[in-house]
Every structure is written in structure tokens, then in C-alpha cells.
């Protein structure tokens, strides 16, 4: 989130009475964590365990298939984006445990908290690419038969990653460490100094490109896809609808608190009560957004179980079925054999 957003423990409200208990030594630190911070820690721990193991498994399953299966390319890239973000979690976890003290230096401050934003943009752009792929399979099957290949898929992914990196640069550039004199603490956050307009611009761009525009375009895209599949009475279209809704909805649900608080904070004075309240919730909003980094493997497994009846196969085998099934370009079948790859859309959910 923007502006110096990491809160300290409660040091009491400094009132203006010049009182000092001369016999009581004063602690310079507080041992109690706020409830939102405790919740954030729990979420971070779960996301780290599920995200690292789940996405590593997805990468392992899809990496072997990526040469020949386009769906595997999509899922591989989404899993890599999620996996990378999860690697920052131990550091973020440690910082919250230490009341947001940041002993890791300036470079780590610029890079690690920016990973979740890189993940957000990479995921949403990859999901947009996947959605375009789904759209073309349904509406331009002949074009797909002629041009849809692994090479083009990799180029599309590279473009998505490149754009994601570009969109993450503002957050990266404005992240700084600030050392507070008392209580003694080093903080990592975003500082726009006097430039409130720039802060608002970054927050608005993030909201529009990372949330509102994808929400609009993907809603329209899947409305068309689902209308077409229903009109053709494609088999398992209800199942497709469920997966699509799960995938797309999870992205927007988990990013919503972060985006709303981010845009609000950019328009508020840093000393205002509302700003300070939102700042206390910041870690929780970030952790909630981080759920996107571990939800994809869960959706794949749940969907896989659904399609297999019940879990009779090993996890890698089940995931392989879900993630590496190639789409048949004949329109009527495009949702029959590859229903599950629409789950890819989900991973846009970072």
C-alpha cells in the first residue's frame, strides 16, 4: 500500500502532561501485537506452506508438459508468479512479528514487498491472455487450428511478464526505509514525500489496471463464452461456469480490501483518524491478497476431484489431468475436453 504504511505497536496516546514516574524504567518496545497483525501472521503462515508446496507441485507437473501443451504453459507461468511471491513471506512474517521493524535493508525493502504487486499484475495479465485464448477457441476455432501454438503462448507470457514488471516499477522506486527516533524502529514503506498527486496517480493506476479494467473485460469475455457454450449446449458447461466463477471471483475478492484501502489512503491526510485506522489494517489486507498465491493449487485439486468423481489418483496425477489436457479447437468440444483449463483464469487472482 502507499504512503508510509506500516504501523507500530501501541505506545499509548502521548498526552501533554509532563509526568514521569522517576522510579519506573521505561520499556522501548511493546510485546503485544494488534489483532489484525496476528490474523495476518496466521494467513501468511498458511499461504506460505500451501503456496510453496502447492505451486512447486504445479510447476513440477506442468514443466514437463509445457513443450507440447499450451494449457500447461499458462499454468506453469501462473504457478511461477505465485511461487515467487511466496518466497517473500518469511521476511514479511518476521517483520510483523517485530512490530513492523525492518532490519533487512533498503534493497530488500524495495524488492520483497513489491513481489505481491508483480504477482498481481503478472497474474491478471496472464489470466487476460488465458481468457483471450479461451475466447479464440470458442469464437475463432479455425484461426486457433492454424496459429495457436506453444511458441505464441510463450511470447504472450513473456509480454505479460514484461508489462507486469513495468507496472511494478513505481512501487519499487518509491519504497524506502525510514528510521524513527522514538520508539526506535526501522520501517519499510512507500514515501511520496510532498507529492500527493503522484501517490494518488499510482493508486488509481493500480486500481484501474489491476482490478477494475480486468473485472470489466473478464466479465464481458466470460459472459460471451458462456452464452455461446450454453447456446450450443456444450457438455459440462455448468461445471465450466463454476470453475470460471471460482477463478475470477477469488482474484477480485482477495484483492478488493487491498485496493479499497490503498485508494482511500492515497486521498487521506496521514495524520487523519481514518488513515491511521486503515494503516492498522494494512498487513491484514496484504495477507488477504496473498491468499491468491496459494488458492490456485487448491482450486485445481478441488476441480480435479470434482471431475474424477473422488480422489482415487495421486495428487501429481490428478493435477496432470487438470492442468495439461489440451484444448480441442473444434468449438463444440473446446469446453468438453478442457473445461478445467478455464481455471487458469483463476490465477489471475493474485
Amino acid at each position: 500500500m502507499d504512503s508510509f504504511n506500516y504501523t507500530t505497536p501501541d505506545y499509548g496516546h502521548y498526552d501533554d502532561k509532563d509526568t514521569l514516574d522517576l522510579n519506573t524504567p521505561v520499556d522501548k518496545t511493546s510485546n503485544t501485537l494488534r489483532v489484525p497483525d496476528i490474523l495476518a501472521l496466521v494467513i501468511f503462515a498458511v499461504v506460505f506452506l500451501v503456496g510453496v508446496l502447492g505451486n512447486a507441485l504445479v510447476v513440477w507437473v506442468t514443466a514437463f508438459e509445457a513443450k507440447r501443451t499450451i494449457n500447461a504453459i499458462w499454468f506453469l507461468n501462473l504457478a511461477v508468479a505465485d511461487f515467487l511471491s511466496c518466497l517473500a513471506l518469511p521476511i514479511l512474517f518476521t517483520s510483523i512479528v517485530q512490530h513492523h521493524h525492518w532490519p533487512f535493508g533498503g534493497a530488500a525493502c524495495s524488492i520483497l514487498p513489491s513481489l505481491i504487486l508483480l504477482n498481481m499484475y503478472a497474474s491478471i495479465l496472464l489470466l487476460a491472455t488465458i481468457s483471450a485464448d479461451r475466447f479464440l477457441l470458442v469464437f475463432k476455432p479455425i484461426w486457433c487450428q492454424n496459429f495457436r501454438g506453444a511458441g505464441l503462448a510463450w511470447i504472450a507470457c513473456a509480454v505479460a511478464w514484461g508489462l507486469a514488471l513495468l507496472l511494478t516499477i513505481p512501487s519499487f522506486l518509491y519504497r524506502v526505509v525510514r528510521e524513527e527516533y522514538f520508539p526506535p524502529k526501522v520501517l519499510c514503506g512507500v514515501d511520496y514525500s510532498h507529492d500527493k498527486r503522484r501517490e494518488r496517480a499510482v493508486a488509481i493506476v493500480r486500481l484501474v489496471l489491476g482490478f477494475l479494467w480486468p473485472l470489466l473485460t473478464l466479465t464481458i469475455c466470460y459472459t460471451f463464452i458462456l452464452l455461446r457454450t450454453w447456446s450450443r449446449r456444450a457438455t459440462r458447461s455448468t461445471k465450466t461456469l463454476k470453475v470460471v466463477v471460482a477463478v475470477v471471483a477469488s482474484f477480485f475478492i482477495f484483492w478488493l480490501p487491498y485496493q479499497v484501502t490503498g485508494i482511500m489512503m492515497s486521498f487521506l491526510e496521514p495524520s487523519s483518524p481514518t488513515f491511521l485506522l486503515l494503516k492498522k489494517l494494512d498487513s491484514l489486507c496484504v495477507s488477504f491478497a496473498y491468499i491468491n498465491c496459494c488458492i490456485n493449487p487448491i482450486i485445481y485439486v478441488v476441480a480435479g476431484q470434482g471431475f474424477q468423481g473422488r480422489l482415487r489418483k495421486s495428487l501429481p496425477s490428478l493435477l496432470r489431468n487438470v492442468l495439461t489436457e489440451e484444448s480441442v479447437v473444434r468449438e463444440s468440444k473446446s469446453f468438453t475436453r478442457s473445461t478445467v483449463d478455464t481455471m487458469a483464469q483463476k490465477t489471475q487472482a493474485v
Epitope: 504512503s3 508510509f4 506500516y6 504501523t7 507500530t8 501501541d10 505506545y11 499509548g12 502521548y14 498526552d15 501533554d16 502532561k17 509532563d18 509526568t19 514521569l20 514516574d21 522517576l22 522510579n23 519506573t24 524504567p25 521505561v26 522501548k28 513492523h100 525510514r178 528510521e179 524513527e180 527516533y181 522514538f182 520508539p183 524502529k185 520501517l187 514503506g189 514515501d191 514525500s193 510532498h194 496521514p270 495524520s271 491511521l276 494503516k279
Partner: antibody
Framework: QVQLQQSGPELVKPGASVKISCKAS????????MNWVKQRPGKGLEWIGR????????KYNGKFKGKATLTADKSSSTAYMQLSSLTSEDSAVYFC????????????????WGQGTTLTVSS | DVLMTQTPLSLPVSLGDQASISCRSS???????????LEWYLQKPGQSPKLLIY???NRFSGVPDRFSGSGSGTDFTLKISRVEAEDLGVYYC?????????FGGGTKLEIK
């Protein structure tokens, strides 16, 4: 009544070292931080660093790292600042300043200043 | 480091007039706990500085109520409602929010 009594003026040669003292009274010495501030004519005020007499923890302005060394003696309620490798740039008035924070973090300010120690570096 | 810029450098006033000194920080000095540690000091010739205002607007004990502080974020002001002879000297703003704490360049309040 809080008082900070600093040592007298010093005249030293370039390259030498000097140790300035600041004796505190009227409050519990280990319950407040002691800061040091430099004032040169026409150059304003500069924060050098601070020491927590309770645990000896120090924090320096990057500009004065290697130049100033802060210490404190709880038994005599005295803070010290040693300045080394002196040059004419170090000629200034040096103040010790109490940083106050009350129990439960009530209040927060640099409230009491010593009378200042004039350091002249000259050959 | 946070640069504290004071204006004006010199402020000639008549006794009984209102005086206003401005201080601007190069970055926000609002701490993560919401507090802003901005102080004002008066230094008379041959003396050490004396604390007047702390935390932007709170008068230190014994400071007359003609002194008042205001501001937020990066812009702060010290006002003296009716200047008296004992108010003459150099006024410094100071931020104690971030390391290293820094002082403004000073404003000399003098008789016209």
C-alpha cells in the same frame, strides 16, 4: 529540578582528542536518553547522536560516525562524548540534551539542555 | 536526512505585533504511530536553546500562551500573538520523528 552541567571550554591541537562531560541531576539518569548537539557559528544546530544510559545503546548521525564516541557512567550520572582526530571543522559549541519520554510514553521532547562546552581546535 | 527549511531568515517586528515563522520539511515527518514530533526552540544570545512547543502544538511547561504552534505533514508554523522584548532571539524548528533528528536553519526575531 533537572540540570545538565557540562565541562568547561577546551582548547586543543589538530589531530588530538577531547572528552566532554555532562553531569545530570534532578531525575533518574538511566530513564532518559542523552543527546549531543553541535553548534557552529553560522552553521546552525546538528544532532551528533544519543546514548541510552540504561543499557549503553547508542545511535549516531552518519556524519559523526568515527568522529564521536558516546559513553555514560550510571554511578556518577554523567554522560561523555569523545571527539577524535580533531580539525578546525570541529571547533564549535557542544550541547548535551536530555531526551524525555515519560512512563507509558507520555510526552516526548528534547527538554533540558546543558549550558554548552566551547571547543576550539587550533595549533 | 530530513531537511528543515525555515522562513524568513530574519523577522523584524515591533513590540506588540504578531509574528509568524514557517518551517517546511523535505518529507513527511508523521511517524508510523500517527504522531508528529515537531518542536520549536528559542535561543537567546550566549544561552542554550529553550523548548517552547513540542508535538507541533503543545506548549512546554512555563511557556506563555502567546506562543502557539500549528501544521501537519510537512508544513508547520510558530505564531507569537504579541511580541515582547524577552521573545527576541533565534527560533529553531526541529523534527525528532526520524533519524537523524534535524534542525531548521533558524529565524532571527529582532526589533524593527
Amino acid at each position: 529540578q533537572v540540570q545538565l552541567q557540562q565541562s568547561g571550554p577546551e582548547l586543543v591541537k589538530p589531530g588530538a582528542s577531547v572528552k566532554i562531560s555532562c553531569k545530570a541531576s534532578g531525575y533518574v539518569f538511566s530513564n532518559s536518553w542523552m543527546n549531543w548537539v553541535k553548534q557552529r557559528p553560522g552553521k546552525g544546530l546538528e544532532w551528533i547522536g544519543r546514548i541510552d544510559p540504561g543499557d549503553g545503546d547508542t545511535k549516531y548521525n552518519g556524519k559523526f560516525k568515527g568522529k564521536a564516541t558516546l559513553t555514560a557512567d550510571k554511578s556518577s550520572s554523567t554522560a561523555y562524548m569523545q571527539l577524535s582526530s580533531l580539525t578546525s571543522e570541529d571547533s564549535a559549541v557542544y550541547f548535551c540534551v536530555r531526551f524525555y519520554y515519560g512512563s507509558n510514553y507520555v510526552g516526548y521532547y528534547f527538554d533540558y539542555w546543558g549550558q554548552g562546552t566551547t571547543l576550539t581546535v587550533s595549533s | 536526512d530530513v531537511l528543515m527549511t525555515q522562513t524568513p531568515l530574519s523577522l523584524p517586528v515591533s513590540l506588540g505585533d504578531q509574528a509568524s515563522i514557517s518551517c517546511r520539511s523535505s518529507q513527511s515527518i508523521v511517524q508510523s504511530n500517527g504522531n508528529t514530533y515537531l518542536e520549536w526552540y528559542l535561543q537567546k544570545p550566549g544561552q542554550s536553546p529553550k523548548l517552547l512547543i513540542y508535538k507541533v502544538s503543545n506548549r512546554f511547561s512555563g511557556v506563555p500562551d502567546r506562543f502557539s504552534g500549528s501544521g501537519s505533514g510537512t508544513d508547520f508554523t510558530l505564531k507569537i500573538s504579541r511580541v515582547e522584548a524577552e521573545d527576541l532571539g533565534v527560533y529553531y524548528c526541529f523534527q525528532g520523528s526520524l533519524v537523524p533528528p534535524t534542525f531548521g536553519g533558524g529565524t532571527k526575531l529582532e526589533i524593527k
